[in-house]
């Protein structure tokens, strides 16, 4: 059957931990992505940012998992109003910020 939302969120959190701890070189060669507002619609916005990073196998599973939280199909070059379009940050920092926010959402029971 379908994975409960709480389990899916916990698995996403654990995947973000894994990719940040297993990196010996800079994550995705130090690629930069648009920063996002960590608010409603955040999963789609996060996916829209990360999907523009190509050739980085370390975040492929994260991209797939985020797509499960986003109700619409996301493709490269797509941007929502949730992006802070004047701020780019390294993928590693993006993942770190997203991870902390998701841990707080998990605590608050916001699984979707």
């Amino acid at each position: 059957g379908p994975v409960p939302p709480s389990t899916a969120l916990r698995e996403l959190i654990e995947e973000l931990v894994n990719i940040t701890q297993n990196q010996k070189a800079p994550l995705c060669n130090g690629s930069m992505v648009w920063s996002i507002n960590l608010t409603a619609g955040m999963y789609c916005a996060a996916l829209e940012s990360l999907i523009n990073v190509s050739g980085c196998s370390a975040i492929e599973k994260t991209q797939r998992m985020l797509s499960g939280f986003c109700p619409h199909k996301v493709s490269a070059g797509q941007f929502s109003s949730l992006h802070v379009r004047d701020t780019k940050i390294e993928v590693a920092q993006f993942v770190k910020d997203l991870l902390l926010h998701l841990k707080k959402l998990f605590r608050e029971g916001q699984f979707n």
Epitope: L100, K103, K104, F106
Partner: antibody, heavy 122, light 108 residues
Framework: QMQLVESGGGVVQPGRSLTLSCAAS????????MHWVRQAPGKGLEWLGV????????HYADSVKGRFTITRDNSKNTLNLQMNSLRAEDTAVYYC???????????????WGQGTMVTVSS | SYILTQPPSVSVAPGQTATITCGGN??????VHWYQQKPGQAPVLVIY???DRPSRIPERFSGSNSGNTATLTISDVEEGDEADYYC???????????FGGGTKLTVL
């Protein structure tokens, strides 16, 4: 100011019961999850259990499950810890602690009482 | 249940930086809190949610959490920082809180 004051500690014989109380003041008690934490002499901190802000849920550490019961009275701003079948290893300072309440009780303990000493000895 | 491992003791000279670790399986997936306890006193929260600091706590105290290790860092250590320090997480699999065994910080 915000305060938690424990009472009810003392010397009790093994196998007997004791109830600790905690009086809260200076904050909106009914909106916080409340916990009990203990510390045996010279040892570390041990979490005992939590009661949700509205009293609807309790969770306990395995070491006290079935022996200790946490209750609260939001109309009187009081928290209680009923301890049954006490053992020598229950000898400790008992702290009443508050934490903001979320869906999961993963919040930090932002206010502690000064503690009350319980000695279990024959 | 979930286990948190801390070094029993850490020693540092005044003015130096103290680093206290807290190890746990994939602890980076959990929110970590840190407490300071001085002899004869109740514990005091010094870091919450991995890296946030209560307003009354000096900026010298900072926290981080990644992989299997959370870290409490105290820079420019003072004699008044001498205390026991405990890390803590909520174990969502067993619905219980877990404390580390504590680390005694000695200021030389």
């Amino acid at each position: 100011q915000m305060q938690l004051v424990e009472s009810g500690g003392g010397v009790v014989q093994p196998g007997r019961s004791l109830t600790l109380s905690c009086a809260a003041s200076g904050f909106e008690f009914r909106t916080y999850g409340m916990h009990w934490v203990r510390q045996a002499p010279g040892k570390g901190l041990e979490w005992l259990g939590v009661i949700w802000y509205d009293g609807s849920n309790t969770h306990y550490a395995d070491s006290v499950k079935g022996r200790f019961t946490i209750t609260r009275d939001n109309s009187k701003n009081t928290l209680n810890l009923q301890m049954n079948s006490l053992r020598a290893e229950d000898t400790a300072v008992y702290y009443c602690v508050r934490a903001p309440q979320w869906y999961l009780t993963a919040e930090a303990f932002d206010l502690w009482g000064q503690g009350t000493m319980v000695t279990v000895s024959s | 249940s979930y286990i948190l491992t801390q070094p029993p003791s850490v020693s540092v000279a005044p003015g130096q930086t103290a680093t206290i670790t807290c190890g746990g399986n994939l602890i980076g997936a959990r929110l970590v809190h840190w407490y300071q306890q001085k002899p004869g006193q109740a514990p005091v929260l010094v870091i919450y949610d991995d890296s946030d600091r209560p307003s009354r706590i000096p900026e010298r105290f900072s926290g981080s959490n990644s992989g299997n290790t959370a870290t409490l860092t105290i820079s420019d250590v003072e004699e008044g920082d001498e205390a026991d320090y405990y890390c803590q997480v909520w174990d969502y699999s067993s619905n219980t809180y877990v404390f580390g065994g504590g680390t005694k910080l000695t200021v030389l």
